[in-house]
Every structure is written in C-alpha cells, then in structure tokens.
C-alpha cells in the first residue's frame, strides 16, 4: 500500500438497530478498488479490545476477533469489490449495542466512519376483535418488545381523543427474560370506525390498524425503525 498513508478515502455508514435474537446488518460503503487483494476491512467496537471482524486479501482474517463476536459475523464477500463493507451480525444480543467503526484500507488510501448501533426488540402488532368480552372490545398483541414500550390507542372518528381511561395494557416477560409480550385491550369500541394501536420505544414504532364495519374487518400494520439516519 505505497500511497495509503497519504490519501483518505470516503467511507459511509448508516445508523441502525438490531432486533435481539435475529440477524442484523451494520451498513458501510467505501470507494471501491479494482483489486480485491488490496482491500482491508476492519470492524471495531468501542470498548471491545478484540476486532469485531477483519477481511483482507479476499478472505476473513479472524485470529484477532473478540470472543463476544465468535461465529456471528460475516461480510458480503462478493460485494466487497464494489465497495460494500457491510457486516452481517447473527443472533443480535442486547450487548451488541454501541459505537462501531468501519475502517477501510485500499490502494487508494484509508478511511473510516463510525456507526451507532442500537439493540432491542420490536415486532408487528396484531389487532383483533375480542369476542369473549362482555362489550365490544379490541385486543392488540405484539410478541416481542424491549425496552418496555408505550402503547397509545387512536381512532379515526374521535381524532385527538384520549383512550387511556378505556384501555388496559400489560407487559409479560418472555421465556428468555429480556423481551416482553405487549397486550393492550380497548373497551367500548364503536362500529364503523378505524382504531389504531401504536406501540413505541426508543428503537421502533409500530402501528396496528383495524377497521370494523357491520360486514367486514380490515387489518393493517406497519413498523418503522427510529433514529436510522441515511
């Protein structure tokens, strides 16, 4: 790397969030090089003394990998040549949260960028009519959340109404003792209305909608990660 000390290359990362127990991606791109053997990728984590991952001379070099990442990391080897240094992190743990550095060396020079990685649990809510209840009741359930979220109900007809007096939310710890199941019940619902159950923590926001008419029930849900800056 004759000139690598004198030039800097552009490295770009994207803040992201990982869902505990699932696989996550730490995104990083750089100015590509024509020769794979000239590219070195190092992923480091603040406060962790071993490497998260290293890729050099066209293959993984994991002798100095920290044990907390053992067997859980991979780069997209076939995409390195086009400037993709993103890291796949398997089985995301709560302790994976923190500041990561994507450090790149190529024949053009070197560069790095930091990335904030949040970890938690988030899942899509499902809203159903609770036919077992004595009055018209909706039940909103989401299987995995962490940290503990807030739950807010809203309705299309009564916009701005506060449903806290007519709803009840409970959090039940899941078997792995970290994530929790969220159950929220809304009482005294009226027909021909669309209700939304909004679950939010500092990592994600999810909404489950249900439209109840005399002839049909329509459901829709979506989830959005917060603070992910492109």
């Amino acid at each position: 790397f004759g000139i690598s000390g004198r030039h800097s290359i552009t490295v770009t990362t994207v803040a992201s969030a990982g869902n505990i127990g699932e696989d996550g991606i730490l995104s990083c791109t750089f100015e590509p090089d024509i020769k794979l053997s000239d590219i070195v990728i190092q992923w480091l984590k603040e406060g962790v003394l071993g490497l998260v991952h290293e890729f050099k001379e066209g293959k993984d070099e994991l002798s100095e990998q920290d044990e907390m990442f053992r067997g859980r990391t991979a780069v997209f080897a076939d995409q390195v040549i086009v400037g993709n240094a993103s890291l796949r992190l398997k089985n995301v743990q709560l302790t994976d949260a923190g500041t990561y550095k994507c450090y790149i060396i190529t024949s053009k020079g070197k560069g790095n960028a930091n990335l904030e990685y949040k970890t938690g649990a988030f899942s899509m809510p499902e809203v159903n009519v609770d036919y077992n209840a004595s009055s018209e009741t909706l039940r909103c359930e989401a299987p995995r959340w962490f940290p503990q979220p807030t739950v807010v109900w809203a309705s299309q007809v009564d916009q701005g109404a506060n449903f806290s007096e007519v709803s009840n939310t409970s959090f039940e710890l899941n078997s792995e003792n970290v994530t929790m199941k969220v159950v929220s019940v809304l009482y005294n619902v009226t027909i021909n209305n669309t209700y939304s159950c909004m679950i939010e923590n500092d990592i994600a926001k999810a909404t489950g909608d249900i439209k109840v008419t005399e002839s049909e029930i329509k459901r829709r849900s979506h989830l959005q990660l917060l603070n992910s800056k492109a």
């Epitope: 406060g47 003394l49 071993g50 994991l62 920290d66 044990e67």
Partner: antibody, heavy 116, light 106 residues
Framework: QVQLVQSGAEVKKPGASVKVSCKAS????????MYWVRQAPGQGLEWMGR????????VYAQKLQGRVTMTRDTSTSTVYMELSSLRSEDTAVYYC?????????WGQGTLVTVSS | DIQMTQSPSSLSASVGDRVTITCRAS??????VNWYQQKPGKAPKLLIY??SRLHTVPSRFSGSGSGTDFTLTISSLQPEDFATYYC?????????FGGGTKVEIK
Amino acid sequence: QVQLVQSGAEVKKPGASVKVSCKASGYTFTAQYMYWVRQAPGQGLEWMGRINPTSGNTVYAQKLQGRVTMTRDTSTSTVYMELSSLRSEDTAVYYCARGINWFDPWGQGTLVTVSS
Amino acid sequence: DIQMTQSPSSLSASVGDRVTITCRASQNIDTYVNWYQQKPGKAPKLLIYAASRLHTVPSRFSGSGSGTDFTLTISSLQPEDFATYYCQQSYTSPFTFGGGTKVEIK
C-alpha cells in the same frame, strides 16, 4: 519492550485474602485484556479470568466466582487480582498475562502460599 | 466449558528427534488454539497462536489443525526444547488449557 511486573510472594492463613498486582509497561495499557492464570505446585495451568482495562469489565472462571475480584488503575497501568476466603488448594503461582486471543507476555509470577 | 485433552502427558526423546504433541477439543473451536512452552520455575512462553502461526520461535516448531484436533510438532528436538508444553483454546471463555506434556531427555 512490553513488560509485566508482578508483586512479591505472599504467605496467608486460611480464610484470609490476598491481593496481587501486575504493572504493565511498554504498550498502551488499555489496548488489550489482562488475564490471570494460576498454577498449583506440580500442576497445570488454570484460567482464572480477565479484565478489560478500558472499561473495568471482568469475566471470571465459574469456580472462583464470588471469591475473585479483578480491578485496574489506569493511572499507573496496574491490574490487581484479589482472592478471598483462601484455602490450602489456592496455594499456587499466580500469573498475569496480556492478550486478546493469546497470552504474550506473561508476568514473572507471584507465589501465594496458604498455610495455617 | 470446553475441555482440552492433551497427549501424551509425558514423553522421553533424544536431541534431533521429531516430537509430536496432540490436543483434542471437546467441541469445534475453529483455529483458536495456542501453544505455550514452560520451563521449571519460569512463566509460560507463547510459541504458536491461531493453531499454526509462529510467534518469535525457531522454525523447527510448527502447529497444525482446526476444528477439534490440533498438533504441535518439533521437527528436530534441541537441548533447550526440554520443557512442558501446554495447548490452550481461546474460542470462548474460560480459555481452558490442556493438561500439559512434559518432554524429557531420554
């Protein structure tokens, strides 16, 4: 050059505590973990645990949990290993060693004798 | 914990002999194995790390293996090589050691 210098030999009574120090020089103290390994007379090597000098976070061998405490002083580049409720089977040479996935170098060792 | 079973526990050999020491891990540890040499009254010294990479030692020492089976070979034993050798896994904590192999003069 990288050096780890340990405190001198100790003789302790059963039930007492011992605190062994390990002073690092010749490298950035916070760049690598510090491990502790012990060796009973005529026996093999036993991994005791490690400390992250940056954060102070520790990992201990299960059999020593509750009796061992590893600390560090970044201002003097020194790590400490304290073992409490000593018993005769704790008689050993105690080593500190620097590393991530392999240990190099090692301290010269500290002989701790537990005897009534 | 991962067990490291080292064999033989001792061996007698002459200067110039080829010596092989083996280590077996109780589970797959990739190439996270290190070998140390210890002489009486001294601290252990790193010989080989990451299964096959020589530290600052003569080329007569070599290491091989991956997964569960690992070997330390001394191609031509020298007088200064009479010592006890330990393997160690660094795949996951606790970083356990093998029981040691004492290489004695025949």
